[in-house]
């Protein structure tokens, strides 16, 4: 089938296009090209007769067309009007006609675009800006770039007018950027020069520097004011409401107390018409002022709060010093000084942090000290202690118990007997007690500031007969030559005598034995294995006596240097070798053997049948006590001789 291919399909203005004919029939008389989609004599471009090889221009011929013998048509120096359809009319020798249509599109080389704006100086948070990419060009695509990046997604950015217009609603200072537009068609792309958006903003609230507000008489006062603003702000200074000067900096040399007052900086933006002011209060001291300490927390809670102590006033070019308990600051991770040393922070205060604290301001001649400040650290209550410590009383005596718990503010106390509230006092007094007064005595301490409560319970027994005592120990398995053991006879009873026996005998005299706590406690220093005996304590008063069950002290010791038996060291070949190792130790040790340094077995006995001279060597027994963590060993040399070579040799076991 006859077809027309346009090469290229999209043609740049001024270039050329070839309408290429495919499947041209044979035995042709001639052919003709027409502008449009049909054969129309008024729109004929050119005709060609094959026999004469003569081309004849038609009414639509522009002088830019060339026809080829293969019927293809070249159009040169393409113009916009050439866009559209072209029809080839083929006349065969048998005078039968055939037609085919092709087309192409002409695009201009795009001009360099430019950006027009509806507002050259938009005001922040007030104005919108519409950028338009010029000129408007048919069949062109429009794109926008901000700081050489594609447009960010933002509800304040809107494209319209076929993307030709970019609108920024409610501009902000951050919209100050480089904007470019790009135009594209199939044959060219162009980019505009950048347009910088100049957003007017501010002034923001001005900042006055430096920040310090306290000065000494004779110093220079040099204040600087700055406010973010576009265009840059115009500044004015007022002192106590009276205009001073229109400058960004205010300088007053050699100030006096009379220069104290309120200093106002006013920033003005002539384009936005806005004013903003900031006021600072300046204090000028005739003498260096006596410093004083302010605290951010007057009643800190122990282990909970931090406290920041600040040395006032803040004075320029001043050295601040601190003392705690009349000493310079100790090195502690809980103490932190600010960069200017003016603020001392105590992290996680404890009851030991009460102080006193002093700060000082150093001047040329001396150091001015603040009055001392004492921190009121709230703590407690700790676990209360009930005194006296007796738990057994005889009928008829007076019971007087006192309770105390470390606390700030001081704790409030309550007494309970067998869970029943008795009284809200620190001391409990019961006269002429009987067996019925036996029971659980509870002291409850409460800190009203922290809201914390702690209790201690004591069992009181009122009895004419003494109870059977028992022995408590602070170390159930002491290690020989290392540990001490303290035995205590329980309970603690009023008007009672305490006695001790060892293996049924009264205590031997020894510098390693010591009685204390009214003979209630027996301490053995540097225990030995010989102290592993039965210990009994006894209690007695005027009406009764009683003894505890015996307690046997389990002393851990060893291992001592082991002994290998039998003692023989020479053996005949063919004998059995049966070595046994023993070491005094508590608990029993673990045994292991090595022959010539090579580990053998973890047994107490080493047995080798029918030994030969190959069994000559060093036999080492190793002992280990896991409880004491100690080790020991012994080495024995064994010689094995060939049978009958030497008299007096053992035959072995």
């Amino acid at each position: 089938k006859l077809t027309i291919e346009s090469t290229p399909f999209n043609v740049a203005e001024g270039k050329e296009v070839l309408l290429l004919v495919h499947n041209l029939p044979q035995h042709l008389f001639g052919y003709s090209w027409y502008k449009g989609e049909r054969v129309d004599g008024n729109r004929q471009i050119i005709g060609y007769v094959i026999g004469t090889q003569q081309a004849t221009p038609g009414p639509a011929y522009s002088g830019r067309e060339i026809i080829y013998p293969n019927a293809s048509l070249l159009i040169q120096n393409i113009i916009q009007n050439d866009t559209g359809f072209y029809t080839l009319h083929v006349i065969k020798s048998d005078l039968v006609n055939e037609e085919a249509t092709g087309q192409f599109r002409v695009y201009p080389e795009l001009p360099k675009p430019s950006i027009s704006s509806n507002n050259s100086k938009p005001v922040e948070d007030k104005d919108a800006v519409a950028f338009t990419c010029e000129p408007e060009t048919q069949d062109a695509t429009y794109l926008w770039w901000v700081n050489n990046q594609s447009l960010p997604v933002s509800p304040r950015l809107q494209l319209s007018n076929g993307n030709r217009t970019l609108t920024l609603f409610n501009v902000t200072r951050n919209d100050t950027a480089s904007y470019k537009c790009e135009t594209q068609n199939p044959v060219s792309a162009r980019r505009s020069d950048s347009v910088i958006l100049n957003v007017l903003y501010g002034p923001d609230a001005p900042t006055i520097s430096p920040l310090n507000t306290s000065y000494r008489s004779g110093e220079n006062l040099n204040l600087s004011c700055h406010a973010a603003s576009n265009p840059p702000a115009q500044y004015s200074w007022f002192v106590n409401g009276t205009f001073q000067q229109s400058t960004q900096e205010l300088f007053i040399p050699n100030i006096t107390v009379n220069n104290s007052g309120s200093y106002t900086c006013q920033a003005h933006n002539s384009d936005t018409g806005l004013n903003r002011t900031t006021v600072t209060t300046i204090t000028v001291y005739a003498e260096p002022p006596k410093p004083f300490i302010t605290s951010n927390n007057s009643n800190p809670v122990e282990d909970e709060d931090a406290v920041a102590l600040t040395c006032e006033p803040e004075i320029q070019n001043t050295t601040y010093l601190w003392w705690v308990n009349n000493q310079s600051l100790p090195v502690s991770p809980r103490l932190q000084l600010s960069n200017d040393n003016r603020t001392l922070t105590l992290l996680s205060v404890t009851r030991n942090d009460v102080g006193p604290y002093e700060c000082g301001i150093q001047n040329e001649l001396s150091v001015d000290h603040s009055d001392p400040v004492i921190l009121n650290v709230l703590y407690g209550p700790d676990d209360p202690t009930i005194s006296p410590s007796y738990t057994y009383y005889r009928p008829g005596v007076n019971l007087s118990l006192s309770c105390h718990a470390a606390s700030n503010p001081p704790a409030q106390y309550s007494w309970l007997i067998d869970g029943n509230i008795q009284q809200h006092t620190q001391e409990l007094f019961i006269s002429n007690i009987t067996e019925k007064n036996s029971g659980l005595y509870t002291c409850q301490a409460n800190n009203s500031a922290s809201g914390h409560s702690r209790t201690t319970v004591k069992t009181i027994t009122v009895s004419a007969e003494l109870p059977k005592p028992s022995i408590s120990s602070n170390n159930s398995k002491p290690v020989e030559d290392k540990d001490a053991v303290a035995f205590t006879c329980e309970p603690e009873a009023q008007n009672t005598t305490y006695l001790w026996w060892v293996n049924g005998q009264s205590l031997p005299v020894s510098p390693r034995l010591q009685l204390s706590n009214g003979n209630r406690t027996l301490t053995l220093f540097n225990v030995t294995r010989n102290d592993a005996r039965a210990y009994v304590c006894g209690i007695q008063n005027s009406v009764s006596a009683n003894r505890s069950d015996p307690v046997t002290l389990d002393v851990l010791y060893g291992p001592d240097t082991p002994i290998i038996s039998p003692p023989d060291s020479s053996y005949l070949s063919g004998a059995n070798l049966n070595l046994s190792c023993h070491s005094a130790s508590n608990p029993s040790p673990q045994y292991s053997w090595r022959i010539n340094g090579i580990p053998q077995q973890h047994t107490q006995v080493l047995f080798i049948a029918k030994i030969t001279p190959n069994n000559n060597g060093t036999y080492a027994c190793f002992v280990s006590n896991l409880a004491t963590g100690r080790n020991n060993s012994i080495v024995k040399s064994i010689t094995v001789s060939a049978s009958g070579t030497s008299p007096g040799l053992s035959a072995g076991a």
């Epitope: 740049a12 050489n148 980019r191």
Partner: nanobody
């Protein structure tokens, strides 16, 4: 201004492939549209392909369409031309060109040019 240096040329058999590179320096690469042109001995300089600033728009000469691919890597400041199904008539000196405001087939739109890299397609 931007400096351009082409590389990757060489001798290749018909039907073979080559990848040309153009390294740019001296200015922000993404601010330039780029094009490839070629010039065979005794012929005029001929447009091959062009790419815009962001890389989203490309344009090819009809003679290379479907065989050559132009691309750019703005992070590496480099322009590429992947040439497949090479023909003897592709033999030429290949130039890289840059413009801040134009991308298309007109060599006069490009003020900055490299020195060229030679591609020879021969069996």
């Amino acid at each position: 201004e931007v400096q351009l240096v082409e590389s990757g040329g060489g001798v290749v058999q018909p039907g073979g492939s080559l990848r040309l590179s153009c390294a740019a320096s001296g200015h922000t690469f993404s601010e330039y549209a780029l094009g490839w042109f070629r010039q065979a001995p005794g012929q005029e300089r001929e447009f091959v392909a062009a790419i815009n600033w962001g890389g989203g728009w490309t344009y090819y000469a009809d003679s290379v369409k479907g065989r050559f691919t132009i691309s750019r890597d703005n992070a590496k400041n480099t322009l590429y031309l992947q040439m497949n199904s090479l023909r003897p008539e592709d033999t030429a000196l290949y130039y890289c060109a840059a413009s801040s405001d134009y991308a298309g087939g007109n060599p006069t739109g490009y003020p900055y040019w490299g020195q060229g890299t030679l591609v020879t397609v021969s069996s």
